[in-house]
């Protein structure tokens, strides 16, 4: 029971996490204009991994995609790559984990196979979560570096009468979504790995021993304790290591695309 619950919960948590990673990757608000020096700006800038946007006080919003590939900073390319790798690994992990779920029966699949698939998906979720956390952290570090650089520039060369305010950027909503989503995916992966251990206990086969009693010859053959799917008609002499209960619930969380435009 505990194993199935752990596996199911790990799957759901990872699903939510991956949906969050997809949402964060698509979001435009990775960095938002810092309003500390100009809280009453009539023009608000924010940027994502794929495009930058300007929202005017009039309500008009204009977004422009980064149509160049070579002209983009290497760090941004790296963040994009990390997020995409995270999504791909997470998606594959989800696909594998669906077949690995103990509550889903596919043919006469052995529990050892399900255990291997659970471990595989768990590792994929862990790597996916780490990719997302790394991607978001690299971007955040880039923002912090640029923020202090632009702050230094802002207070130098202001001898003239005309003041040119340099736009500074701070953390956007997508960073927090990414961190949380990455963390959830990581936790889900760990839960899947824990569930894997309970799914595949080592087989302990006891040799058949014959006890000869006078008058009767009765052979006691204790069946080897073996993990089973419980699938099929003959379940005699089989100990099912899932506590007997199964959940048929499938919790689905669809990736939501947050459009801030």
């Amino acid at each position: 029971m505990a194993v199935t619950a752990c596996q199911g919960l790990g799957f759901v948590v990872s699903l939510i996490g991956i949906a969050g990673i997809i949402a964060a990757t698509c979001m435009d608000q990775w960095s938002t204009q810092d309003l500390y020096n100009n809280p009453v700006t009539a023009v608000f800038n924010y940027q994502g991994l794929w495009r930058s946007c300007v929202r005017e006080s009039s309500g008009f919003t204009e977004c422009r995609g980064y149509f160049t590939l070579l002209g983009l900073p290497a760090m941004l390319q790296a963040v994009r790559a990390l997020m995409i790798v995270g999504i791909v690994l997470g998606a594959i992990g989800l696909l594998v984990s669906i077949f690995a779920l103990k509550c889903i029966r596919i043919g006469s699949m052995e529990d050892s196979a399900k255990a291997n698939m659970t471990l595989t998906s768990g590792i994929m979720f862990i790597v996916s979560g780490l990719c997302a956390i790394a991607g978001v952290s690299v971007f955040a570090n880039m923002l912090v570096t640029n923020f202090w650089m632009s702050t230094a520039n802002m207070y130098t060369g202001m001898g003239g009468m005309v003041q040119t305010v340099q736009t500074r950027y701070t953390f956007g909503a997508a960073l927090f979504v990414g961190w949380v989503a990455g963390g959830l995916t990581l936790i889900g992966g760990v839960m899947m790995c824990i569930a894997c251990r309970g799914l595949a206990p080592e087989e302990t086969n006891y040799k058949a021993v014959s006890y000869h009693a006078s008058g009767h010859s009765v052979a006691y053959k204790p069946g080897g304790f073996k993990a089973s799917t419980g699938f099929g008609s003959n379940t005699k002499n089989k100990k099912i290591y899932d506590g007997g209960a199964r959940t048929e619930d499938e919790v689905q969380s669809y990736p939501s695309k947050h459009d801030y435009v």
Epitope: A42, Q47, V54, S58, F60, R64, V162
Partner: antibody
């Protein structure tokens, strides 16, 4: 055709109050931010206040803050300007205007005149 | 607050002449996010409300004759009328659309020589 018609102007005593209205037609009022701008006789344009399409964001000129209140009723397609503690220097033609891209004011009403005098 | 300074305050011209008026802001109106300058030009005829001519410093509003051209970037802007017509002899205002409070220049008045 876009139309903005101001009303509520007139003669007011110093320290008095007045509520100006701006009736909008010919466009989806609830989609646009709106502004009040005034012009004293033989003087230039002076911005008063801005209200966003859903009334979530409001800005005032420092000199008018606390005395003037901008509001809107999207159901009635009407913009308002409540003016209190009026002074002689508030004598002007009051215009309402529609806010569009580029943070520009593309359509203006004909204006309503407010005279503050004892 | 951003201070808008227009020059000259008045300009005497003849019909058909090319006219240039200036507007200077105390702070840059160039937005780095879209590389657009948030400066607007208006024309106001006596007894009428202002009319939008140009926004984003150089984008002509629909219906505005192409003899009106806006230019400039950062803090220095210009409105040029390539061939002045009689109906153009009125007052022109520039406006900051970059930050609140939205501020207007004192205006440039075009008069017939």
């Amino acid at each position: 055709e876009v139309q903005l018609v101001e009303s509520g102007g007139g003669l007011v005593k110093p320290g008095g109050s007045r509520k100006l209205s701006c009736a909008a037609s010919g466009f989806t009022f609830s989609d646009y931010g709106m502004h009040w701008v005034r012009q004293a006789p033989e003087k230039g344009l002076e911005w008063i206040a801005h209200i966003s399409s859903g009334s979530s964001t409001i800005y005032y000129a420092d000199t008018m803050k606390g005395r003037f209140t901008i509001s809107r009723d999207n159901a009635k397609n009407t913009l308002f300007l409540q003016m209190t503690s009026l002074r002689s220097e508030d004598t002007a033609m009051y215009y309402c205007a529609r806010f569009v891209r580029g943070n520009a004011l593309d359509y203006w009403g004909q204006g309503t005149s407010v005279t503050v005098s004892s | 607050d951003i201070v808008m300074t227009q020059s000259p305050s008045s300009l005497t011209v003849t019909a058909g002449e090319k006219v240039t008026m200036n507007c200077k802001s105390s702070q840059s109106l160039l937005n780095s996010g879209n590389q657009k300058n948030y400066l607007t030009w208006y024309q106001q005829k006596p007894g009428q409300p202002p009319k939008l001519l140009i926004y984003w410093a150089s984008t002509r509003e629909s219906g505005v004759p192409d003899r009106f051209t806006g230019s400039g970037s950062g803090t220095d802007f210009t409105l040029t009328i390539s061939s002045v017509q009689a109906e153009d002899l009125t007052v022109y205002y520039c406006q900051n659309g970059y930050s609140y409070p939205l501020t207007f220049g004192a205006g440039t008045k075009l008069e017939l020589k």
